[in-house]
Interface confidence: low
């Protein structure tokens, strides 16, 4: 499949439209700090040049990879090494290591300003006045915040971006058909960046083969009637398409990922019978669609796994003459039978079979040695069973606000030296499991938690990596992949830790904060709650609440006071010396 | 702690009807295939029917088609077998086990068919 010009051949299967907003992703991702019109000149640049290419594919450069060609044109920023610092160096290598410089320089966390939303009437007006720069600006203002963003999946955000204006914009009442969207969209894009966020570091920390297993395991939940043949070709070709977008070849990417929604929708009789309402659907919504799609019916008649991965006389051979292959089908059985356990969970019963196989296929006796392996499991299953039904209890009799407050302090107390950001921003995030996932059956619960959960965590993973500060995040981060949400769980209280001075500006608020949507405020309670925490990690649970109420209480009375601001300095006072004498401070 | 608790079984007459009910619980039962196996006097189990989670999808040995059916209501935890035209061959002890899987140490109903 050689073509003679790389970028012709993606220009003509992907369309001038995509074409250009997947190469404006592209930089977006890769320059976070650069201004939108120099990013549309090198956009335009591209394009034109590429249309040579369609013209006459043996033209000069056309022959180039793409990676030739985008990193040559990132290089020309004339401001490179001002904005970017280090980055620049990457300019001073060669392909494929430029690419990997560039790579190694996204940053999770760009200090970028937040996104303001603007009035309504300001937003519709731009969209009217030209379009097409309007949809631009939502890909970039997104794409730079999040480096890793599935860029397909983007392109389908940016169509229903579109389509939320096209339709708000002529309604009697544009802010109540437009806002909902638009907040829709927002906490949307959040949820995928991070899911797709914890495949790219699946691959990148750990392996292909990590990121194989985890798509047999999901795969087979979804399509249980599939063959394990049939899993492990979707199995291959996504580990490409995954590989691709988290490695900065977006075109390369979204062609394999329609090429990938074409060959599933060809073959659904053999694959599910949940795809037929996507497989009608336009392309973005149709790779949109199968990806997000209910879990099929199990077979009828599946045999007990018993008789071919314990009882049977041939495990250890069948182990050995094909390692990965026999695992696979181990995962894919299991998984295709457990539609009620989290992929992390079936991981982690696959680890331990393999385990036991490299043990026991050693051994003198090696089917005494593995037949009770399938007890080894309960406990492994029980651990996450049991943790769920804890704090979906938890969760119910607290709500989501006070919930996320009890992560809060338990995350503190397990890991102080994070940063307080990154603290609320992730615990914020567990808490929302609730919500998300109590409200499921039982046989729902596991996969929507312990799965979301993993998503989560990869967050406080990535943002710690960028500054590292405790041992404990960086082991529990780097040691194992499905390990991760137990390692954070059994973490106690750091006993090492050298509490917090106390610093009484800290807890200095001011007549702004009223005026601060709910969530907002909601934020700057709980910053105050994990620095009282570092302050006062041993604090008990009813001090802290005690304090939060107090907090709670002199916000409120300060907001409905006719002079706010000398209520906060006054009575701000008195909260800090009666929380200071209600924790011992 | 899993149980299945199966009913509906007797003494019949070649040629008559039963229903067997199978009360499922401690699982998620609309999660998961069933099936109905048997295991006559002296014999070892032998598998009957089985249908999907969604109910959907159903199977059955050869020398059952035709003549039973198996269904499930998932709202009620419960499984069935409605069995007609029933032969002396048809006696065993009749009881249901999740996917495909060996009996999950349910006590089974005795179907016996005789004039």
């Known amino acids: 499949d050689a073509h003679k010009s790389e970028v012709a051949h993606r220009f003509k299967d992907l369309g001038e439209e995509n074409f250009k907003a997947l190469v404006l992703i592209a930089f977006a991702q890769y320059l976070q700090q650069c201004p939108f019109e120099d990013h549309v000149k090198l956009v335009n640049e591209v394009t034109e040049f590429a249309k040579t290419c369609v013209a006459d594919e043996s033209a000069e450069n056309c022959d180039k990879s793409l990676h030739t060609l985008f990193g040559d044109k990132l290089c020309t920023v004339a401001t490179l090494r001002e904005t970017y610092g280090e980055m620049a160096d990457c300019c001073a290598k060669q392909e494929p290591e430029r690419n990997e410089c560039f790579l190694q320089h996204k940053d999770d966390n760009p200090n970028l300003p937040r996104l303001v939303r603007p009035e309504v009437d300001v937003m519709c007006t731009a969209f009217h006045d030209n379009e097409e720069t309007f949809l631009k600006k939502y890909l970039y203002e997104i794409a730079r915040r999040h480096p890793y963003f599935y860029a397909p999946e983007l392109l389908f955000f940016a169509k229903r971006y579109k389509a939320a204006f096209t339709e708000c914009c002529q309604a009697a009442d544009k802010a109540a058909c437009l806002l909902p969207k638009l907040d829709e969209l927002r906490d949307e894009g959040k949820a995928s960046s991070a899911k797709q966020r914890l495949k790219c570091a699946s691959l990148q920390k750990f392996g292909e083969r990590a990121f194989k297993a985890w798509a047999v395991a999901r795969l087979s939940q979804r399509f249980p009637k599939a063959e394990f043949a049939e899993v492990s070709k979707l199995v291959t070709d996504l580990t490409k398409v995954h590989t691709e977008c988290c490695h900065g070849d977006l075109l390369e990417c979204a062609d394999d990922r329609a090429d990938l929604a074409k060959y599933i929708c060809e073959n659904q009789d053999s694959i599910s019978s949940k795809l037929k309402e996507c497989c009608e659907k336009p392309l973005l919504e149709k790779s949109h669609c199968i990806a997000e799609v209910e879990n099929d019916e199990m077979p009828a008649d599946l045999p007990s796994l018993a008789a071919d991965f314990v009882e049977s006389k041939d495990v250890c051979k069948n182990y050995a003459e094909a390692k990965d292959v026999f695992l696979g089908m181990f995962l894919y059985e299991y998984a295709r039978r457990h539609p009620d356990y989290s992929v992390v969970l079936l991981l982690r019963l696959a680890k331990t079979y393999e385990t036991t196989l490299e043990k026991c296929c050693a051994a003198a006796d090696p089917h005494e040695c593995y037949a009770k392996v399938f007890d080894e499991f309960k406990p492994l299953v029980e651990e996450p069973q049991n943790l769920i039904k804890q704090n979906c209890e938890l969760f119910e009799q607290l709500g989501e606000y006070k919930f996320q407050n009890a992560l809060l302090v338990r995350y503190t107390k397990k890991v102080p030296q994070v940063s307080t950001p990154t603290l609320v921003e992730v615990s914020r995030n567990l808490g929302k499991v609730g919500s998300k996932c109590c409200k499921h059956p039982e046989a729902k619960r596991m996969p929507c938690a312990e799965d979301y959960l993993s998503v989560v965590l990869n967050q406080l993973c990535v943002l710690h990596e960028k500054t590292p500060v405790s041992d404990r995040v960086t082991k529990c981060c780097t040691e194992s992949l499905v390990n991760r949400r137990p390692c954070f769980s059994a973490l106690e209280v750091d006993e090492t830790y050298v509490p917090k001075e106390f610093n009484a500006e800290t807890f200095t608020f001011h007549a702004d904060i009223c005026t601060l949507s709910e969530k907002e405020r909601q934020i700057k309670k709980q910053t105050a709650l994990v620095e009282l925490v570092k302050h006062k990690p041993k604090a008990t649970k009813e001090q802290l609440k005690a304090v939060m109420d107090d907090f709670a209480a002199f916000v409120e009375k300060c907001c409905k006071a006719d002079d706010k601001e000398t209520c906060f300095a006054e009575e701000g006072k008195k909260l800090v010396a009666a929380s200071q004498a209600a924790l011992g401070l | 702690e899993v149980q299945l608790l199966e009913s509906g079984g007797g003494l019949v007459q070649p040629g008559g009807s039963l229903r067997l009910s199978c009360a499922a619980s401690g699982f998620t039962f609309g999660s998961f295939g069933m099936s109905w196996v048997r295991q006559a006097p002296g014999k070892g189990p032998e598998w009957v029917s089985a249908?999907?989670?969604?109910?959907?999808?159903?199977r059955y040995a050869e020398s059952v088609k035709g003549r039973f059916t198996i269904s499930r209501d998932n709202s009620k935890n419960t499984l069935y077998l409605q069995m007609n035209s029933l032969r002396p061959e048809d006696t065993a002890v009749y009881y249901c086990t999740i996917g495909r899987s060996a009996s999950r140490g349910s006590q089974g109903t005795l179907v016996t068919v005789s004039s």
């Open positions: 249908i999907d989670s969604g109910g959907a999808d159903t």
